[in-house]
């Protein structure tokens, strides 16, 4: 459960791909499409509005107890704008939508060697948002292989 | 109830080698980002080394780089310290710790084994 | 590294008063938005304790008199009204970067 409604802090930050391809929004046909792309060097980056929630890790061994304390995130590139996970279609999509937010928004936010994170469903413990042709989408990780997969690594900066 | 257990500790020479383990229960171990953390005798606390989870990346402070390996069994549930050239100021209670999940902070400690290095 | 100096060394305190223990960083701990400067209390013969995390938020259990603020390079645990079991040593820690760092510790003691 998320402790409280209100994020604990909030922060502006680009995104990019570990490899330094840029996270970019657009408006289509009034929905929002989601790029993964080498931006132009004078292009100005697209920002996200990331709000930051404390929330309980459930234990995963006992099942109804709690293991302590996880950082999740949501993420709004533009107002009344969230990313949220389709696990049906393992797609990344962005939703109009009102508070409270649907599970979906939520992301547990992980911290990675180089300066990086990694994004995992609430709603889906080991989906991860990753980058598949050039697209942003949900894919399964093994934690005991692959969570250093450069696909699900990806930057923030101010 | 999440538990970790040290083990491992003891009075070893100078340039001698000494294995620490830290047996885990409780939770997903290989979910987790572990580390060792130690305290010199009336000291404070200094971090030693990190393994992330599914053992993709280590990290260690610079006066152990080296000399000490950090490493982990999942199958097992249980984290490793292999120290080796030791030295006098390497004596100190050793601690196993388990960072929160997502890794932002140690969060789980366990109760420490006594390394003593001495002639 | 970044270098966590805490202040005062001693706090001599009776129960029920404040505690107002400081934290400060050579350079900002900031990441992504997050303060990442932990605090842990410690007990003779005991491991560390989470007490605070990303500068404000109480670790599981933590009682609601303990309390964390600050930002950038300044922090601060505050602890409302002391209790008997509140006496021990207090680190701050960053992990905004390896090697990750503690402050070398404040001791509350009984007056």
């Known amino acids: 459960s998320i402790t409280g409604i209100s994020p604990i802090t909030e922060s502006l930050a680009s995104l990019s791909t570990y490899n330094d391809q840029s996270i970019t929004f657009a408006l289509e046909d009034e929905s929002y499409e989601i790029y993964v792309e080498d931006l132009k060097k004078d292009k100005k980056k697209d920002k996200v509005l990331l709000s930051y929630y404390e929330s309980q890790h459930p234990s995963s061994e006992s099942g109804d107890g709690v293991d302590g304390k996880m950082l999740m995130v949501t993420l709004s590139p533009t107002k009344d704008f969230w990313l949220q996970a389709n696990n049906k279609e393992h797609s990344v999509e962005l939703h109009k939508c009102e508070k409270p937010l649907p599970d979906q928004a939520f992301f547990v936010l992980h911290n990675r060697s180089f300066n990086c994170v990694s994004f995992e469903c609430k709603t889906d413990p080991g989906v991860f948002i990753g980058v598949k042709d050039n697209h942003l989408a949900l894919i399964k990780v093994d934690y005991s292989e692959n969570l250093g997969s450069e696909n699900i690594l990806f930057k923030l900066s101010e | 109830e999440v538990q970790l257990v040290e083990s491992g500790g003891g009075l070893v020479q100078p340039g001698g080698s000494l294995r620490l383990s830290c047996a885990a229960s409780?939770?997903?171990?290989?979910?987790?980002?572990m580390s060792w953390v130690r305290q010199a005798p009336g000291k404070g606390l200094e971090w030693v080394a990190t393994?992330?989870?599914?053992?993709?990346?280590?990290d260690y402070v610079d006066s152990v780089k080296g000399r000490f390996t950090i490493s982990r069994d999942d199958s097992k549930n249980t984290l490793y310290l292999q120290m080796n050239s030791l030295r006098a100021e390497d004596t100190a209670v050793y601690y196993c710790?388990?960072?929160?999940?997502?890794?932002?902070?140690?969060?789980?400690w366990g109760q420490g084994t006594l390394v003593t290095v001495s002639s | 590294e970044i270098v966590l100096t805490q202040s005062p060394a001693t706090l001599s305190l009776s129960p029920g008063e404040r505690a107002t223990l400081s934290c400060r960083a050579s350079?900002?701990?900031?990441?992504?938005?997050?303060?990442?400067l932990n605090w842990f209390q410690q007990k003779p013969g005991q491991p560390p304790r989470l007490l605070i995390f990303?500068?404000?938020n109480r670790g599981s259990g933590i009682p609601a008199r303990f309390s964390g603020s600050g930002s950038g390079t300044d922090f601060t645990l505050t602890i409302s009204s002391l209790e008997p079991e509140d006496f021990a040593v207090y680190y701050c820690?960053?992990?905004?970067?390896?090697?990750?760092?503690f402050g070398q510790g404040t001791k509350v003691e009984i007056k």
């Open positions: 710790t388990r960072a929160n999940y997502g890794n932002w902070f140690f969060e789980v």
């Open positions: 409780g939770f997903t171990f290989s979910s987790f980002s």
């Open positions: 393994i992330s989870g599914g053992k993709t990346f280590t």
């Open positions: 350079e900002s701990v900031a990441k992504y938005g997050l303060s990442l």
């Open positions: 990303a500068a404000s």
């Open positions: 820690q960053q992990s905004k970067e390896v090697p990750f760092t």
